[in-house]
Interface confidence: low
């Protein structure tokens, strides 16, 4: 494909998430709780998520031989989610990375939420056309992912407090993922 433009739509995707969901994994629900924010007086059960960026992408789709006649517009979900207690840090507050629980086994990732299916026409070099049915992303959300214990997590502690948005979140595959992987 060819990316013509990617515009940051970021507008605080704020989604309440249950503090203690079922431990059983289901198609639309990731496992267990969010990363705990330790050493603060803030409520650990507060799990409103912020900071999930939605990027608006305009691109042409190609299957190798044929290219879309008109560009496809969709959202791209950027990979950061921050629990509410980190927000002061993210907007320039004084919290540092040391407040992240070293032992927590939960992580967050910004993933696809809502999608829609559409048909797109591709023009081929020999003059013929092909029609594909694809699913494009229309909204993003924060998704919880439980990693197995004993994974390396030293990078969380080594990041600079000056750039708190850099707390990376591991991810659990969203069940409503984009059904075309051209991007």
């Amino acid at each position: 494909f060819k990316n013509d433009a990617t515009e940051i739509l970021y507008s605080h995707v704020v989604k309440p998430v249950p503090a203690h969901p079922s431990s059983n994994s289901t198609l639309n629900q990731a496992r267990n709780g969010g990363r705990h924010f330790s050493n603060t007086g803030l409520d650990r059960n507060t799990r409103v998520q912020v900071g999930c960026r939605e990027l608006r992408s305009t691109k042409y789709i190609s299957d190798g031989q044929c290219t879309s006649i008109s560009p496809l517009k969709e959202l791209v979900c950027a990979g950061e989610c921050l629990p509410l207690p980190v927000l002061p840090n993210w907007i320039g507050g004084g919290y540092g990375t040391k407040y992240w629980s070293r032992r927590s086994s939960q992580e967050w990732r910004c993933v696809n939420d809502k999608t829609r299916t559409q048909r797109i026409q591709l023009q081929c070099q020999d003059g013929s056309t092909r029609t594909y049915k694809i699913t494009v992303v229309t909204a993003c959300k924060c998704k919880r992912y439980t990693r197995q214990h004993n994974e390396s997590s030293h990078n969380f502690e080594s990041m600079s407090p000056a750039k708190p948005v850099q707390h990376h979140r591991e991810r659990k595959r969203a069940s409503k993922s984009s059904k075309h992987s051209m991007s």
Partner: antibody, heavy 118, light 107 residues
Framework: QVQLVQSGAEVKKPGSSVKVSCKAS????????ISWVRQAPGQGLEWMGW????????RYNRKFTGRVTITADESTSTAYMELSSLRSEDTAVYYC???????????WGQGTLVTVSS | DIQLTQSPFSLSASVGDRVTITCRAS??????LNWYLQKPGKAPKLLIF???TSQSGVPSRFSGNGFGTDFSLIISGLQPEDVGTYYC?????????FGQGTRLDIK
């Protein structure tokens, strides 16, 4: 079109380190996950770890923790995988792979053969 | 870690045959299972992701199904270019793991 181009083959001594590069083109590098996967001769695929290019956040397979370091340089759209304390069993083709939406590997580099031999 | 066991280890089939490769996970991974084809001397190529979704540009004769612990890759109408080693891979939990591979060749 997304492309991942890796550095050339390396021959290393046991105990030394190797650093393999993976230059990405097409797409937005900063919002991608780059994983490293290795394949010993005649063997299967083994995931080593990934980096989220936009932040430098990493996660490693615990089998390699302490020996592998994955980094990224946004200015050149290049990811790196450094493996230290090499031993003969680290002889393998090392692939970088760009993840799709969440944990499947949509695009792959051509592979870099690392041979560890005394 | 989650173990993935593929079967058969290898198989030979004729052009036009329907071929099924299975992948069993050591614990439930929902639909977080992907399939790749690796040809000799080449990098793997994504065929199917999320258990049943075809990657763009992959021929329609490739399909996938399954949920939980048991998954299948089906090739409906084997073609000569389908030879190679097929791998399943789970992305349900870290570390991501692959099956040991199934080698497919033409009779």
């Amino acid at each position: 079109q997304v492309q991942l181009v890796q550095s050339g083959a390396e021959v290393k001594k046991p105990g030394s380190s190797v650093k393999v590069s993976c230059k990405a083109s097409g797409g937005t590098f900063s919002s991608t996950y780059i994983s490293w996967v290795r394949q010993a001769p005649g063997q299967g695929l083994e995931w080593m770890g990934w980096i989220y290019a936009g932040t430098g956040g990493t996660r490693y397979n615990r089998k390699f923790t302490g020996r592998v370091t994955i980094t990224a340089d946004e200015s050149t759209s290049t990811a790196y995988m450094e493996l230290s304390s090499l031993r003969s069993e680290d002889t393998a083709v090392y692939y970088c792979a760009r993840e799709g939406v969440d944990g499947w590997f949509t695009y792959w580099g051509q592979g870099t053969l690392v041979t560890v031999s005394s | 870690d989650i173990q993935l066991t593929q079967s058969p280890f290898s198989l030979s089939a004729s052009v036009g045959d329907r071929v099924t490769i299975t992948c069993r996970a050591s614990q439930s991974i929902n639909d977080n299972l992907n399939w790749y084809l690796q040809k000799p001397g080449k990098a793997p190529k994504l065929l199917i992701f999320a258990a049943s979704t075809s990657q763009s540009g992959v021929p329609s004769r490739f399909s996938g199904n399954g949920f939980g612990t048991d998954f299948s890759l089906i090739i409906s109408g084997l073609q000569p270019e389908d030879v190679g080693t097929y791998y399943c891979q789970q992305n349900d939990s870290m570390p991501f793991t692959f099956g040991q591979g199934t080698r497919l060749d033409i009779k």
